[in-house]
Interface confidence: low
């Protein structure tokens, strides 16, 4: 049966006994700035190109052992959510991965900046179709990271980021607080904001919309055919990156403003239980859960 | 991580001691009425003191960025400080990433073309 998260983002007009979403996103390249990935996983094999970009801090602790499957875990799962053969949103999208997070899932603002610069330079050297950049990471508010995101967005790149898993105002974090970035919070199968231990999804006016982010089935780096369930605003952001890729593939000339408008337009409205949010944040937090456009307007590429 | 350590870690073999250059004496004064600002992460445990992103004004060319970085190294060297330019930015934002002592911030903020300086900080998978 179709995983709950894919069903949630799929409008009724797609639905049949079997989940067969359009093979969308084929005109779009999605850049993933995350951990290293297992590019030969069957979910993403041939769909993800690992760039030679790597800018990560050393792992903390003298006893830390780099285990490939652990190092690749976060990025592999997200690549699968975006474009995985079985459990991906935009099955036609091609991806490029940049390593900006170490085996502990930690990176730096400077490393992320250099990664964004790498993307811009790649875009200038070899202009392709629409670009989506997925930033499934968060740090404290950073003027320079927000500024770099703004510049990249003004160059026509769509940036999608995690709202953060701190059960806090997303405006206190970057790149979530960057106005030009599409910032995504996480909801679960019950349309509740996701709780993660004692924390949970961020909220507030810097969040653009929510997407499935709890118990998301995706590629596991434990083996080339393994699947695992992961939760977080990264997973939510990956759904929106996939939806954006499909929309941009359908209409490559969409501006960021139009894309944002359409993401909001096709979202399920007023389904999130707002009682989870602090009272003063309820009116500021968008009650929107991302969804694909009806298939009438999906642009399919049969190659 | 290593990139975010203070210079006191003894890792001097990597660092280049910038010699005083001729152009050090030709430092332009910062534009009148503009003051560069310093920013750092509000979440203390996530701060990475010792590494700084020096952001230059929008229209600054790569050659000016490189020149400003060299000037910083030269002026720091005169004061007995080691610095290392880790990356020169161009394409998105003009500027450079420098590994240096926080003692040099005041000096760096007065360099020509500087818009603001931000201390590096951690980001995390979500």
């Amino acid at each position: 049966s179709i995983p709950w998260n894919l069903e949630r983002i799929t409008p009724p007009r797609y639905r049949a006994d079997e989940y067969q979403p359009p093979d969308g996103g084929s005109l779009v390249e999605v850049y993933l700035l995350d951990t290293s990935i297992q590019s030969d996983h069957r979910e993403i094999e041939g769909r993800v190109m690992v760039t030679d970009f790597e800018n990560v801090p050393e792992e903390d602790g003298t006893r830390f052992h780099r285990q490939a499957s652990k190092c690749d875990s976060h990025g592999t799962h997200l690549a699968g959510v975006v474009s995985g053969r079985d459990a991906g949103v935009a099955k036609g999208a091609s991806m490029r991965s940049l390593r900006v997070l170490n085996c502990q899932g930690k990176g730096t603002v400077s490393g992320t900046l250099i990664g964004l610069e790498f993307i811009r330079k790649s875009q200038l050297v070899q202009p392709v179709g629409p670009l989506v950049v997925l930033l499934p990471l968060a740090g404290g508010y950073s003027r320079v990271l927000n500024a770099a995101c703004q510049r990249l967005a003004r160059a026509g790149v769509v940036l999608v980021t995690a709202a953060g898993n701190f059960r806090d105002d997303a405006c206190l974090y970057s790149p979530a607080s960057a106005p030009e970035v599409i910032t995504v919070g996480a909801t679960n199968a019950q349309d509740q904001p996701v709780t993660l231990g004692t924390l949970g999804t961020n909220f507030g006016r810097c969040v653009d919309l929510f997407a499935p982010g709890e118990d998301i089935i995706g590629a596991s780096s434990d083996c080339s055919t393994c699947f695992v369930s992961q939760s977080g605003t990264s997973q939510a952001a990956a759904h929106v990156a996939g939806i954006a890729a499909m929309m941009l593939s359908a209409e490559p000339e969409l501006t960021l403003a139009e894309l944002r408008q359409r993401l909001i337009h096709f979202s399920a409205k007023d389904v999130i239980n707002e009682a989870w949010f602090p009272e003063d944040q309820r009116v500021l937090t968008p009650n929107l859960v991302a969804a694909l456009p009806p298939s009438t307007h999906e642009n399919l590429y049969f190659q | 991580g290593a990139m975010g350590q203070e210079d006191e870690d003894g890792d001097y073999e990597e660092l280049v001691l910038a010699l005083r250059s001729e152009e050090d004496g030709l430092a332009e004064a910062p534009e009148h009425g503009t003051t560069a600002t310093f920013h750092r992460c509000a979440k203390d445990p996530w701060r990475l003191p010792g590494t700084y992103v020096v952001v230059l004004k929008e229209e600054t060319h790569l050659s000016q960025s490189e020149r400003t970085a060299r000037r910083l190294q030269a002026q720091a060297a005169r004061r007995g400080y080691l610095t290392k330019i880790l990356h020169v930015f161009h394409g998105l934002l003009p500027g450079f990433l420098v590994k240096m002592s926080g003692d040099l911030l005041e000096l760096a903020l007065k360099l020509p073309h500087v818009d603001y300086i931000e201390e590096d900080s951690s980001v995390f998978a979500q």
Epitope: M247, E258, R262, P294, T296, H297, N299, L300, Y301, F302 | -
Partner: antibody, heavy 119, light 109 residues
């Protein structure tokens, strides 16, 4: 320039059949849902049917279900409407339209072909 | 009987602002975007407004659309004689049909 040109209209007796064609040019035809919209003389617009990019999904207005069949040939950049058991109330100008891939809209229209059902 | 309800006619003098309404239900306008088409006699309709309020390129900014609940409206400001035409609203419906209004004939007095 994107163009849709309809053909195949004409005068037919009630109960008769017609096959309308629409030739598309200037667009990647296989990327779009396509529709037929009709307009009876002096009346408003009425959507008739539409078809998915690969032909795997088709929808019809209730009044033509079981009588009309929409189809397409992507290799020929062509859209068709097979009309059987025609009735007087099917008399209209039939236009082929492209459904935009965004925004729920018919963004390109053909000039239409007239179908008259009369004895 | 059209699924969407429009006034059969509307009129205004040059320079005036004219509004045409379109009423539907939760299965169409209430949950979908609305489009407006302009049709001159003997010609094919032209997309005027899509996604409630967006103008395709080439459509003057005198034309604007809005939606509230299960109703939508088309406003034409600075009315000009060349705006005399038929105007249709349309939306996708949960019944898996496109639905149109019966059309409004705009007369410029």
């Amino acid at each position: 320039e994107v163009q849709l040109v309809e053909s195949g209209g004409g005068l037919v007796q009630p109960g008769g059949s017609l096959r309308l064609s629409c030739a598309a040019s200037g667009l990647t035809f296989s990327n779009f849902w396509m529709s037929w919209v009709r307009q009876a003389p002096g009346k408003g617009l009425e959507w008739v049917a539409n078809i998915k990019q690969d032909g795997s999904e088709k929808y019809y207005v209730d009044s033509v279900k079981g009588r009309f069949t929409i189809s397409r040939d992507n290799a020929k950049n062509s859209l068709y409407l097979q009309m059987n058991s025609l009735r007087a109330e099917d008399t209209a100008v039939y236009s082929c339209t492209r459904e935009s891939n965004w925004g729920f809209a018919f963004d390109i229209w053909g000039q239409g072909t007239m179908v008259t059902v009369s004895s | 009987q059209s699924v969407l309800t429009q006034p059969p006619s509307a009129s205004g003098t040059p320079g005036q602002r004219v509004t045409i309404s379109c009423s539907g239900s939760s299965s169409n306008i209430g949950s979908k975007t609305v489009n407006w088409y302009q049709q001159f006699p003997g010609t094919a309709p032209k997309l005027l407004i899509y996604s409630n309020n967006r103008r395709p390129s080439g459509v003057p900014d005198r034309f604007s659309g809005s939606k509230s609940g299960t109703s939508a409206s088309l406003a034409i400001s600075g009315l000009q004689s060349e705006d005399e035409a038929d105007y249709y609203c349309a939306a996708w419906d949960d019944s898996l049909n496109w639905v149109f209004g019966a059309g409004t004939k705009l007369t410029v007095l």
